[in-house]
């Protein structure tokens, strides 16, 4: 006889990275017929939801109206059908951003490079942090970690056109509290031999639209939320 139900999926909307004082919704998707969902934060019960009618609902939402550093951390959820509880979901790392200061991001040799050249990103933040994070925006977004007193290096190796895209970096005060994002750097990778020297950095949008980006980047990817978040967070760990 089955002792537990399959684990639910957990994700954050619009994103697991939440600017401070902004809202976020933690979603937990279990099974139809679940009479209770529990959200746990850092191992303790945080919130409970009892869907009505349970047979027509397989997902609940826990709303956080005002993100802050106390709300940042690891969340998981479970659900119950009758007396039978599920396995706990994977951990969701909820990160608060826009804390304290803004790092600067530079790329060497420059933002326009030729396929095969080796590229290094440098993230600098003068305030007290020793961990830095580099993110490439987009659906296949991934996070790289770097360490240093005031700056960190992120070598990409010989680049291909797959490295094209917009990059940002953060300073991390702890695993769940990050700085404001840097201005974006758009990396252009070309295969031809045009002169790319002294090509200016070409940000696609200013820093204050980062929130909009977070809202729109996952559009149409509802089913991918848990996978995307889980992949990015594994890299964070």
């Amino acid at each position: 006889q089955q002792q537990t139900l399959p684990k639910p999926f957990i994700w954050a909307e619009p994103h697991f990275m939440v600017p401070k004082e902004k809202q976020v919704t933690i979603c937990c998707q279990g099974n139809y017929g679940a009479v209770e969902y529990q959200l746990h934060f850092e191992g303790s019960l945080f919130a409970v939801d009892r869907p009505k009618p349970p047979e027509r609902i397989n997902k609940v939402q826990f709303y956080i109206p005002d993100m802050n550093s106390r709300m940042a951390g690891q969340y998981s959820c479970i659900y119950r059908v009758g007396e039978l509880w599920s396995e706990p979901s994977n951990l969701l790392d909820l990160v608060v951003t826009e804390m304290y200061d803004t790092p600067t991001l530079s790329v060497h040799p420059g933002p326009e490079v030729i396929s095969g050249e080796k590229v290094t990103f440098y993230c600098r933040l003068d305030t007290a942090t020793s961990m830095f994070l580099l993110l490439k925006e987009g659906r296949s977004s991934h996070v790289q970690r770097g360490y240093g007193k005031v700056q960190a290096e992120f070598p990409l190796g010989p680049v291909t056109t797959a490295h094209r895209g917009t990059y940002r970096c953060f300073g991390s005060y702890n695993n769940h509290a990050w700085s404001f994002p840097s201005e974006p750097v758009k990396l252009l990778v070309t295969g031809d031999i045009e002169n790319t020297s002294l090509a200016p950095e070409d940000p696609t949008f200013p820093a204050d639209t980062w929130g909009t980006y977070l809202l729109t980047t996952e559009t149409g990817l509802q089913k991918d939320h848990a996978l995307w978040d889980h992949t990015a967070q594994n890299l964070l760990r």
């Epitope: 530079s106 060497h108 790319t196």
Partner: antibody
């Protein structure tokens, strides 16, 4: 056109410091790396370090970390390199080079360390 | 640090001759290699970047290529102003390093 202007020469005493300048024109100074390179008389070239004027990111050759300090003044589009505790080994021509790929070079400043 | 071994250190050649200079990288540098020219008065000019990309204003007789860890600068037909010093420079892995230089002399 792009120009990097450096003073022709500096005469300094052993143990003293010197601050070399490199004034950029003809491009957006804050958008590109600035490198510094050393050439001893009749010898090859050695990379000292680089600075990104916009971000303040600096990267040094470990060999020169305690010798050179790179700074910029964005308002005058000028890069600086301070060399400290000078000895005869520091007598050389020092070049600045603009752009990550060293696209543009200054004429170099000859530093002579002599009592 | 990546060592750049440049050969030959000096080369005598005649006007109109085709010559090649080589730099061997001790580690993988991808295509992150420049060729520089230094005049007797010390003036430095970049000729080639990213292994094979010709700088604007540089004569077409200069070309760059790669074979494995060997990088070459070829001058197809030497002219009088070409008899100066040449250096390779890798900018793949910090500290960026230069080859020892090649002095090109007229025969």
């Amino acid at each position: 056109q792009v120009q990097l202007q450096q003073p022709g020469a500096e005469l300094v005493k052993p143990g003293a410091s010197v601050k070399l300048s490199c004034k950029a024109s003809g491009y957006t100074f804050t958008s590109y790396w600035m490198h510094w390179v050393k050439q001893r008389p009749g010898q090859g070239l050695e990379w000292i370090g680089m600075i990104h004027p916009n971000s303040g990111v600096t990267k040094y050759n470990e060999k020169f970390k305690s010798k050179a300090t790179l700074t910029v003044d964005k308002s005058s589009s000028t890069a600086y390199m301070q060399l400290s505790s000078l000895t005869s080994e520091d007598s050389a021509v020092y070049f600045c080079a603009g752009d990550g790929r060293f696209a543009y070079w200054g004429q170099g400043t000859l530093v002579t360390v002599s009592a | 640090d990546i060592q750049m071994t440049q050969s030959p250190s000096s080369l005598s050649a005649s006007l109109g001759e085709r010559v090649s200079l080589t730099c061997r990288a001790s580690q993988d540098i991808g295509s992150s290699l420049n060729w520089l020219q230094q005049e007797p008065d010390g003036t430095i000019k970049r000729l080639i970047y990213a292994t094979s990309s010709l700088d604007s204003g540089v004569p077409k007789r200069f070309s760059g290529s790669r074979s494995g860890s060997d990088y070459s600068l070829t001058i197809s037909s030497l002219e009088s102003e070409d008899f100066v010093d040449y250096y390779c420079l890798q900018y793949a892995s910090s500290p960026w390093t230069f080859g020892g230089g090649t002095k090109l002399e007229i025969k």
